[in-house]
Amino acid sequence: AILGRSETQECLFFNANWERDRTNQTGVEPCYGDKDKRRHCFATWKNISGSIEIVKQGCWLDDINCYDRTDCIEKKDSPEVYFCCCEGNMCNEKFSYFPEMEVTQPTSNPVTPKPP
């Protein structure tokens, strides 16, 4: 392990479409991948009229967009589906939305998901 880097071995798993996809609905997912590549966690969610609906959470393959991010934060302005990724075990338990382009203070607060 490289000093100061969070190795990701497992992530929070959630799948809103678990019946259709024939997976578990929630749990802990061990992250697999090529031994020399980095692994991350991700979260995806929708904001339906102010209500947060988690779509999926799980492991994410080596992605420079996720390097050295200990927190799962979506920075894209008003995406249709929110996505964030991070490094470190279970770092996707909490996720937030702080759009980069915002000049004013972000109105959204960090989200702690409560699976239905």
Partner: antibody
Framework: QVQLVQSGAEVKKPGASVKVSCKAS????????INWVRQAPGQGLEWMGT????????SYAQKFQGRVTMTRDTSISTAYMELSRLRSDDTAVYYC????????WGQGTLVTVSS | QSALTQPASVSGSPGQSITISCTGT?????????VNWYQQHPGKAPKLMIY???KRESGVSNRFSGSKSGNTASLTISGLQAEDEADYYC???????????FGGGTKLTVL
């Protein structure tokens, strides 16, 4: 083992559209991106765009903006690339590749545009 | 994003070393460790050889190595073998906020 299997060769007329599929297996489809790359006969590789397989978010090369649409169906681990208003210079082999590093590639789909 | 610049061709004899360059700008190759190298044999799909400037892809021979100096990334192949004869492309990571771009390709001939 990781595999990306693409749909078969297509022959299209100028002005038509083509939709190429890329079925992934051997890994969790929703754990990365799918990139699309094309290669005209005797030419180099040309990046067309990418889709985040879990969120569906896309980024397209400026050259193809307005003409290309990338989608995916997570229930069958398949990504799609549709190119519209085809011209003869769109004749090429179209590849899908996994992840931001393009670490696994499909076998390629030859699209021939000819009147 | 403009294409990366590679020499059109290079050649070498078996056992020799060759280097293929890939020149970009300070905003792509120069500032990010996200250049990759691909090998493509005629009629086949490209194969990832080196990613993130210098990391060898799993299963790739240690005769292949990558490096970077300033705005130029390089692929070095030592102990050239006949099967190394192929086209080589440099390219960048693509996904999220990063847009992909490839070099024009370099044809390697093993004499």
């Amino acid at each position: 083992q990781v595999q990306l299997v693409q749909s078969g060769a297509e022959v299209k007329k100028p002005g038509a559209s083509v939709k190429v599929s890329c079925k992934a297996s051997g890994y969790t489809f929703t754990s990365s991106y799918i990139n699309w790359v094309r290669q005209a006969p005797g030419q180099g590789l040309e990046w067309m765009g990418t889709i985040n397989a879990v969120s569906g978010s896309t980024s397209y090369a400026q050259k193809f903006q307005g003409r290309v649409t990338m989608t995916r169906d997570t229930s069958i681990s398949t990504a799609y690339m549709e190119l519209s208003r085809l011209r003869s210079d769109d004749t090429a082999v179209y590849y899908c590749a996994r992840g931001g590093w393009f670490d696994y590639w499909g076998q390629g789909t030859l699209v021939t545009v000819s009147s | 994003q403009s294409a990366l610049t590679q020499p059109a061709s290079v050649s070498g004899s078996p056992g020799q070393s060759i280097t293929i360059s890939c020149t970009g700008t300070s905003s792509d190759v120069g500032s990010k460790n996200y250049v990759n190298w691909y090998q493509q044999h005629p009629g086949k799909a490209p194969k990832l050889m080196i990613y993130g400037v210098s990391k060898r892809e799993s299963g790739v021979s240690n005769r292949f190595s990558g490096s970077k100096s300033g705005n130029t990334a390089s692929l070095t192949i030592s102990g050239l073998q006949a099967e190394d004869e192929a086209d080589y492309y440099c390219g960048t990571f693509a996904g999220g906020k990063y847009y992909g771009v490839f070099g024009g390709g370099t044809k390697l001939t093993v004499l």
